[in-house]
Amino acid sequence: CKAMHVAQPAVVLASSRGIASFVCEYASPGKATEVRVTVLRQADSQVTEVCAATYMMGNELTFLDDSICTGTSSGNQVNLTIQGLRAMDTGLYICKVELMYPPPYYLGIGNGTQIYVIDPEPCPDSDF
């Protein structure tokens, strides 16, 4: 398959509610109409799939119902949001883009976005 350049931010800090968003941008060589986006997490040299979606250009990304990811697309950019993150989920999140149709198939893998997640301090008990 032919390599494709994929850009994503180097670092993102998750919100106090455990939500992290970042943009994944790819340099499409042709006029792809069907694109597959996969988010991979790399931690301790282990790579696991976080979520994946295949979408038609101009349409919304559709992740599985139980997915922790949501996203929107605009041109050659995909805006990804990962929810429900905790401190233990801190790691490198890699954006993988595949142009599925029409052929030829193109594959692009970003350098990864380091997402830092800090668990919020528990609220102290208060007496009223």
Partner: antibody, heavy 114, light 111 residues
Framework: EVQLLESGGGLVQPGGSLRLSCAAS????????MSWVRQAPGKGLEWVSG????????GYADSVKGRFTISRDNSKNTLYLQMNSLRAEDTAVYYC???????WGQGTLVTVSS | QSVLTQPPSASGTPGQRVTISCTGS?????????VHWYQQLPGTAPKLLIY???NRPSGVPDRFSGSKSGTSASLAISGLRSEDEADYYC???????????FGGGTKLTVL
């Protein structure tokens, strides 16, 4: 190593049917668009039909529309071409190809003759 | 008649440089799709020679090169050798046909 092995070719009478198969190995079959390309004796290459990874998109050359049907089984890594109402002009070597003809099988000969 | 136009024949002497053209339209090459080139030696299946306009698969000598401009593409073979005698085809995706289109092929003769 990528391997594409076509089968199902042979001699058939005009108006008859044949089903070609292509067994694929050495790559992630379910990721790729697949095509059938044919070459009549002494002629050039002609794209016959193609199918997207999910089978959602299928395309056919005008010369075979309504007569040929392409399908795939990703669980079996196999591509198919059902050929009906065969004509003498369908006589050719039929090649199975991956993606935009990146890899080719060795081909299977289809002869339509009475 | 093919959607992509190639000269039916080309020739050259050993060591020479030859160029084969492939002319398309706004629904294929002009639409921004990548052009691919194939070599078919006598009695064998075609083999990918150039993909994505100008990329060589591993094992293809750097004597072969491809380029694309507007609605046309070309294949150049430098330092021509006798084993280069073969049929050469270009191919590209075509929007209006929703499929792959091939050129009519060019028979290269090494004199």
């Amino acid at each position: 190593e990528v391997q594409l092995l076509e089968s199902g070719g042979g001699l058939v009478q005009p108006g008859g049917s044949l089903r070609l198969s292509c067994a694929a190995s050495g790559f992630t079959f379910s990721d790729y668009y697949m095509s059938w390309v044919r070459q009549a004796p002494g002629k050039g290459l002609e794209w016959v039909s193609g199918i997207s990874w999910s089978s959602r998109d299928k395309g056919y050359a005008d010369s075979v529309k309504g007569r040929f049907t392409i399908s795939r089984d990703n669980s079996k890594n196999t591509l198919y071409l059902q050929m009906n109402s065969l004509r003498a002009e369908d006589t050719a070597v039929y090649y199975c190809t991956t993606d935009l003809a990146r890899y080719w099988g060795q081909g299977t000969l289809v002869t339509v003759s009475s | 008649q093919s959607v992509l136009t190639q000269p039916p024949s080309a020739s050259g002497t050993p060591g020479q440089r030859v160029t084969i053209s492939c002319t398309g339209s706004s629904s294929n090459i002009g639409a921004g799709y990548d052009v691919h080139w194939y070599q078919q030696l006598p009695g064998t299946a075609p083999k990918l020679l150039i993909y994505g306009n100008d990329n060589r698969p591993s094992g293809v000598p750097d004597r072969f090169s491809g380029s694309k401009s507007g609605t046309s593409a070309s294949l150049a073979i430098s330092g021509l050798r006798s084993e280069d005698e073969a049929d050469y085809y270009c191919a590209v995706w075509d929007d209006s046909l929703n499929g792959v289109v091939f050129g009519g092929g060019t028979k290269l003769t090494v004199l």
